[in-house]
C-alpha cells in the first residue's frame, strides 16, 4: 500500500456528535515509501490510484486515511467495538509522522486508547490488524502482561489496564 500525498480535508462538526475536529495545516509531509499492509477487512474504500480518499464529516483526513477523535471515555474493548460498529478500527500508528499528526489534533494531555494490546496467546504487543509492533519505531512504557492495552500521551505509548476508561481514536 503506497503512501499517498492527498489533500488534507477540514471536517466540520456534524449534527450527530459533540466531537470537534481540527484542520491540519498540511505541514506534515511524508516521504514516498511503503506502509505495512493492513488487512482487506480494514480497508473501507476502494484505494486504487485514481480514487483519492475523501473522509466523512467529523473525520479528519491524513495520508489517505480517515481519523475520528472521541470526546467521551470508554474502556479499550468498548472503544474497539465502537470503531468496529462504524466499519473502522482503533488507531494503528505506522510512523512518527503519523504520531505527530495525531498528537497535533489531540490538543490535550490525557491518555487516549489506540489499537494495540498485549495478547497472551502471542505474548507480544499486537495491533488490531494482527501485525506486531515495530520495536525499532515504538517503545511501550509499562508492563507487558495480560490485560494490558496501549494508550498514547504526548507522543509516547504507555501500557495501561484495558478496563481503564480513556478517549480513543478510530481510523479507516
Amino acid at each position: 500500500l503506497l503512501v499517498s500525498q492527498g489533500v488534507l480535508l477540514k471536517c466540520q462538526k456534524g449534527s450527530c456528535s459533540n466531537a470537534t475536529q481540527y484542520e491540519d495545516t498540511g505541514d506534515l509531509k511524508v516521504n514516498n515509501g511503503t506502509r505495512r499492509n493492513i488487512s482487506n477487512k480494514d480497508l473501507c474504500a476502494s484505494r486504487s490510484a485514481d480514487q483519492t480518499v475523501l473522509c466523512q464529516s467529523e473525520w479528519l483526513k491524513y495520508q489517505g486515511k480517515c481519523y475520528w477523535f472521541s470526546n467521551e471515555m470508554k474502556s479499550w474493548s468498548d472503544s474497539y467495538v465502537y470503531c468496529l460498529e462504524r466499519k473502522s478500527h482503533l488507531l494503528i500508528i505506522h510512523d512518527q509522522l503519523e504520531m505527530a499528526f495525531i498528537q497535533k489534533n489531540l490538543r490535550q494531555l490525557n491518555y487516549v486508547w489506540i489499537g494495540l494490546n498485549f495478547t497472551s496467546l502471542k505474548m507480544t504487543w499486537t495491533w488490531v490488524d494482527g501485525s506486531p509492533i515495530d520495536s525499532k519505531i515504538f517503545f511501550i512504557k509499562g508492563p507487558a502482561k495480560e490485560n494490558s492495552c496501549a494508550a498514547i500521551k504526548e507522543s509516547k505509548i504507555f501500557s495501561e489496564t484495558c478496563s481503564s476508561v480513556f478517549k480513543w481514536i478510530c481510523q479507516y
Partner: antibody, heavy 117, light 110 residues
Framework: SLEEYGGDVVQPEGSLTLTCTAS?????????ICWVRQAPGKGLEWIGC????????TCYATWAKGRFTISKTLSTTVTLQMTSLTATDTATYFC?????????????WGPGTLVTV | DIVMTQTPASVEAAVGGTVTIKCQAS??????LAWYQQKPGQPPKLLIY???ILESGVPSRFKGNGSGTQFTLTISDLECADAATYYC????????????FGGGTEVVVK
C-alpha cells in the same frame, strides 16, 4: 436468508411487534441488522438498526425514536416493536443485513411483511 | 441525520440507451454510498457499494461514481429488465450512525 413475520391489520394507536428470523447464520458478528419500510407506492425509508456484535448497540432514524424499538431476542431473531401506530405507518416492513466487510451495504434482505393500520 | 436527495424522480429511455441518476448527500459521506434496484413486489437488490464497486453478479453496464456529497449511477445499454426503481443509500459514521435512502428514481424503458 432473512424472513419477516408478524405483519397484520392493526387499529390506530395500537401496537405491533415484527420478527426477523435468520436462516443459515446467526445474529452474532461485526455487522448490523436493520429495518426498512416502504409505504404503498412510495420509496424506501430507513427505520433503524441493531449491531449483531456483543454491544447490541441500536440506532434509529430521528422520526422513529421513541415509537420504534429494535432488539435481539435470540441468536437468530431480531424484533421491531412499534407503538402508537397511525395510518402513515402502513407499509411493507423489510429486515436487512449489513455485510460484515469494511463496506456499508445491505446484501441480504427479507421478502417483507405488510402492516396495515 | 444525513439527508439523501435523489434526482430525477422518473426517467424514460429507449432500449440500448443510457440513463444517469444523481444522488446528493447533505454532508460528506466519503465514498460510503450504495445503489439498489427494486422491482414491484420484491425487496431491493444491491447493485453497487463503496460508491463505485459492482456487487458480484451485477452487469458492468451499471456504473457508480462520485464521492463526498455528489454521486451518480449510470446505466448504459439499457435492457427491458432494467425497468425498475433505483435507490441510493448513504451511510453515516458519526456517533449516531444512520443509513438514509434517497427518494428513488423510476426508470422506464421504452
Amino acid at each position: 436468508s432473512l424472513e419477516e413475520y408478524g405483519g397484520d391489520v392493526v387499529q390506530p394507536e395500537g401496537s405491533l411487534t415484527l420478527t426477523c428470523t435468520a436462516s443459515g447464520f446467526s445474529f452474532s458478528g461485526n455487522y448490523w441488522i436493520c429495518w426498512v419500510r416502504q409505504a404503498p407506492g412510495k420509496g424506501l425509508e430507513w427505520i433503524g438498526c441493531i449491531y449483531a456484535g456483543s454491544s447490541g448497540s441500536t440506532c434509529y432514524a430521528t422520526w422513529a425514536k421513541g415509537r420504534f424499538t429494535i432488539s435481539k431476542t435470540l441468536s437468530t431473531t431480531v424484533t421491531l416493536q412499534m407503538t402508537s401506530l397511525t395510518a402513515t405507518d402502513t407499509a411493507t416492513y423489510f429486515c436487512a443485513r449489513d455485510t460484515g466487510s469494511g463496506y456499508w451495504k445491505y446484501n441480504i434482505w427479507g421478502p417483507g411483511t405488510l402492516v396495515t393500520v | 441525520d444525513i439527508v439523501m436527495t435523489q434526482t430525477p424522480a422518473s426517467v424514460e429511455a429507449a432500449v440500448g440507451g443510457t440513463v444517469t441518476i444523481k444522488c446528493q448527500a447533505s454532508q460528506s459521506i466519503g465514498r460510503d454510498l450504495a445503489w439498489y434496484q427494486q422491482k414491484p413486489g420484491q425487496p431491493p437488490k444491491l447493485l453497487i457499494y463503496g460508491a463505485s464497486i459492482l456487487e458480484s453478479g451485477v452487469p458492468s453496464r451499471f456504473k457508480g461514481n462520485g464521492s463526498g456529497t455528489q454521486f451518480t449511477l449510470t446505466i448504459s445499454d439499457l435492457e427491458c429488465a432494467d425497468a425498475a426503481t433505483y435507490y441510493c443509500q448513504g451511510a453515516d459514521r458519526s456517533s449516531t450512525p444512520s443509513w438514509p435512502f434517497g427518494g428513488g428514481t423510476e426508470v422506464v424503458v421504452k
